[in-house]
Interface confidence: medium
Amino acid sequence: YDFTNCDFEKIKAAYLSTISKDLITYMSGTKSTEFNNTVSCSNRPHCLTEIQSLTFNPTAGCASLAKEMFAMKTKAALAIWCPGYSETQINATQAMKKARKSKVTTNKCLEQVSQLQGLWRRFNRPLLKQQGSSDYKDDDDKHHHHHH
């Protein structure tokens, strides 16, 4: 799915209102420096691509995130604020229902959610941009001068 046409500000508002708190709840008891952030993203559509992948795609050692509260709210936000996103996820949802039978919090899952927190942080706060400046690195940001 191409996240270029999503309403980034509405997704950000959803994150600040609820998703961030659910991520913190999931990570409660874990030190903020326990995991190194190895996943990064360059611009907002890229961040959402990485967020979707880490949240919904099963990985070795962590196959249960999709049923977590933060994942369900992430899915809802993307469905509401990304045109056509829901349609692309129907088959994926069926696969997830078959693959995930229980919620198990493993160290690998904690590490993955730590990566997610970093991706969300980057999505929410791309650096401030000067209108008409040559500092732009991300094509999507050229059309979004107000990042909040």
Epitope: L16, S42, R122, Q131, K137
Partner: antibody, heavy 120, light 111 residues
């Protein structure tokens, strides 16, 4: 505990440059925007610019764009702010600050400040 | 640039009194229903300390006597009952639009 420790006070001549360092600890340095703010004696706060250590991307206040250079050394979790062509009005306390954990856009961790005095 | 105008410049009150500080933006700092206005407290020789974020949310470890309100262009910081340690300079800050800007500050002094 997240902490920022800045380099010591500097006295510089007009026209010269100064480079202030800010060493981070207690958090994953590469995933937080790092900002620089200055405060002239008896004055308010003025934003200089910011850098994202993850890829070195920078953003500057236009007022400082030609004179300020922000860099990072990820291996030592240190941010740097260099200001060139110094003039007397650059005399100020320079702070580094970490942008918050969630993307709200506030500064939740500050360095102790570095006093830069520009005098002939 | 968004200009933040704080008033009054100086506020003289006694411990136990209620303090009301204002910050007015030259244009709205709201986006998607959220107000991106933050407040800091600064004491002499110290860096600023976050008091409130997004207009009304208390920063970590900040006493409940501090509260904030407002949206769009008009924001208020209220200290319900002043303690001796509250006498300091207070700054508002917006990050909705580049460049990030601060207000000029309100000095809260003991009467």
């Amino acid at each position: 505990e997240a902490q920022l420790v800045q380099s010591g006070a500097e006295v510089k001549k007009p026209g010269s440059s100064v480079k202030v360092s800010c060493k981070a600890s207690g958090f994953t340095f590469s995933t937080y925007n790092m900002h620089w703010v200055r405060q002239a004696p008896g004055q308010g706060l003025e934003w200089i610019g910011a850098i994202y250590p993850g890829n070195g991307e920078t953003s500057y206040n236009q007022k400082f764009k030609d004179r300020a250079t922000l860099t990072v050394d990820k291996s030592t979790s240190t941010a740097y702010m260099e200001l060139s062509s110094l003039r007397s009005e650059d005399t100020a306390v320079y702070y580094c600050a970490r942008e918050d954990d969630y993307g709200e856009g506030y500064f939740d961790v500050w360095g102790q400040g570095t006093t830069v005095t520009v005098s002939s | 640039d968004i200009v933040l105008t704080q008033s009054p410049a100086t506020l003289s009150l006694s411990p136990g009194e209620r303090a009301t500080l204002s910050c007015r933006a030259s244009e709205s700092v709201d986006n998607s229903g959220l107000s991106f206005m933050h407040w800091y407290q600064q004491k002499p020789g110290q860096p600023p300390r976050l008091l409130l974020y997004r207009a009304s949310n208390l920063g970590s470890g900040i006493p409940a006597r501090f509260s904030g309100s407002g949206s769009g262009t008009d924001f208020t910081l209220t200290i319900s009952s002043l303690e001796p340690e509250d006498f300091a300079v207070y700054y508002c800050q917006q990050i909705n639009t580049d460049p990030l800007t601060f207000g000029q500050g309100t000095k809260l002094e003991i009467k």
